[in-house]
């Protein structure tokens, strides 16, 4: 959470001389309350915008817009404090609009905007606009707050931002997972244009449960330049456990820009459909059990194995 670096922050508009200042988030009117204070903002609108920094990076920013109520309290409005709180870290950033001239009623409702709060992908923010001076203790609140969830890097608009690109958002592995038989799973995906290794993480689950019944990790060495953008396929050997049939395959890249914190892509294979009608019970019982060629369970130390190769 920070302010966009290179922009001259302006809030003046026809009929109002105004300057934007950094704020400690504790306006002086908290400490020295005034008798007459303005009413709260009428509406706050927040949306996501993408701006470029002076270093040419594209960053997500919050576009905050609000309007004033059309009451006489605008005569006592000296400015506004904008506060953004990042929920998960409790980091807060504030700026103050300082009105250098008195507001007057005019034919249009007064409207203010600010688009300089740089935010992080997949984070939640509380945006508060506080009219100044702030009310006396027990006075009517003159602020309005709204929450805003910044989309994650999967979102089309976010994908092209620098923080998302750094975490590998432009790579689309287009994963396909296919069950070859009860013991083998084939995974195909597109390699990115970087000589970096990948990891395939296989987690298997019983039909209706979220506790894994099998886990396997497979390492894919860094491809050569001629293999960039090619399809790579891997055959993973499954643990032959009855009912351990739902498989989640996650591909973790290790790009130089994000190392072990790159965006992962996953695909899931569901358990085969159970027949709607139960098998009919025979009206006779066999005198012996047919011999089974293989056991349903393997030894615990029989780990899944795999092999892979790249397609050209």
């Amino acid at each position: 959470l920070r302010l966009l670096d290179h922009r001259a922050l302006v809030c003046s508009q026809p009929g109002l001389n105004c300057t934007v200042k950094n704020s400690t988030c504790l306006d002086d009117s908290w400490i020295h309350p005034r008798n007459l204070t303005p009413s709260s903002p009428k509406n706050i609108y927040i949306n996501l915008s993408v701006s470029s920094t002076q270093h040419g990076e594209l960053v997500p920013v919050l576009h905050v817009e609000w309007t004033l109520q059309t009451d006489a309290s605008i005569l006592y409005l000296e400015g506004a404090e904008l506060s953004v709180l990042q929920l998960n870290t409790n980091e807060r950033l504030c700026v103050r609009f300082e009105f250098l001239s008195k507001l007057r009623h005019h034919h249009r409702r007064w409207r203010f905007t600010f688009s300089h709060f740089v935010v992080d992908p997949d984070q939640e923010y509380e945006v508060t606009v506080h009219h100044l001076p702030k009310p006396i203790p027990d006075g009517d609140p003159n602020h309005q707050s709204k929450n805003f969830l910044v989309p994650d890097c999967e979102h089309a608009r976010m994908k092209v931002t620098t923080p998302c690109m750094s975490s590998g958002s432009l790579w689309d592995p287009n994963i396909t997972v296919e069950t070859l038989d009860t013991q083998h799973l084939r995974v195909d995906f597109t390699l990115w244009n970087e000589s970096t290794h990948y990891q395939i993480l296989l987690t298997s689950f019983p039909h209706m449960e979220n506790h894994s019944c099998f886990e396997h990790m497979h390492h894919i060495p860094a491809p050569r330049p001629e293999e960039f953008h090619q399809r790579s396929n891997v055959t993973l050997t499954l643990r032959n456990l009855k009912g351990c049939c739902r498989h989640q395959v996650q591909i973790q890249p290790f790009f130089s820009s994000c190392l072990n914190d790159c965006l992962r892509h996953s695909a899931t294979v569901s358990c085969p459909e159970m027949p709607d009608t139960p098998e009919p019970i025979p009206d006779y019982m066999p005198l012996w059990e047919p011999r089974s060629g293989s056991s349903d369970y393997k030894d615990d130390d029989d780990k899944g194995s795999s092999h892979h190769h790249h397609h050209h």
Partner: antibody
């Protein structure tokens, strides 16, 4: 001194209700999001709920969703947890906790005990 | 929701030993991870936040590392007062889930 003091715990029958309070002092309460965390006897920590500084963002753990309500009164420097439709598994010590700027929770209350039993 | 796992669930070590506890997230959480120490009958205390930043007042024998899905809490030289249960907690997005805990005692 920065302090959080919980109150309102007690014994209640399954299906009953309780309201927990947390009184904050020594810091600007209205600048912080606040959390409730609980710990069942002999078990680990379970995050319960968070409320942002101006109450515009609220989240709950799945285990309490629809039954518990978090709220705050910044003028009174107080945080609340209204617990309805209580179950045996809600028996725990309930802590209110203040997040640290940068992450984690650096200020905790001493906890208040809730016992749900018939 | 992202699951948090910790290993081992308990450990015994001698005074002066180097102790390592690992915490794993089922999906990447960047460096949004905190570690807590809880002594019997007490409330938890923050040791480390942002995966590797030491909370003020915490002895320097505690350190944290990791990013993405795999994290480590290390006590470089175990002291008698370090007997406690240690929890990791992810805070990238709500729910801010805790790990199941690792109980540390002295041999």
């Amino acid at each position: 001194e920065v302090q959080l003091v919980e109150s309102g715990g007690g014994s209640v029958q399954p299906g009953g209700s309780l309201r927990l309070s947390c009184a904050a002092s020594g810091f600007t309460f209205s600048s912080y999001s606040m959390n409730w965390v609980r710990q069942a006897p002999g078990k680990g920590l379970e995050w319960v709920s968070i409320i942002s500084s101006r109450s515009s963002i609220i989240h709950y753990a799945d285990s309490v969703k629809g039954r518990f309500t978090i709220s705050r009164d910044n003028a009174k420097n107080s945080l609340y947890l209204q617990m309805n439709s209580l179950r045996d598994e809600d028996t725990a010590v309930y802590y209110c906790a203040r997040p640290k700027v940068g992450g984690g929770m650096d200020v905790w209350g001493q906890g208040t005990t809730v016992t749900v039993s018939s | 929701d992202i699951q948090m796992t910790q290993s081992p669930s308990s450990l015994s070590a001698s005074v002066g030993d180097r102790v390592t506890i690992t915490c794993r997230a089922s999906q990447g959480i960047s460096n949004y991870l905190a570690w807590y120490q809880q002594k019997p009958g007490k409330f938890p205390e923050l040791l480390i936040y942002a995966a590797s930043t030491l909370q003020s007042g915490v002895p320097s024998r505690f350190s944290g590392s990791g990013s993405g899905t795999d994290f480590t809490l290390t006590i470089s030289s175990l002291q008698p007062e370090d007997v406690a249960t240690y929890y990791c907690q992810k805070y990238n997005r709500a729910p801010f889930t805790f790990g199941p805990g690792t109980k540390v005692d002295i041999k």
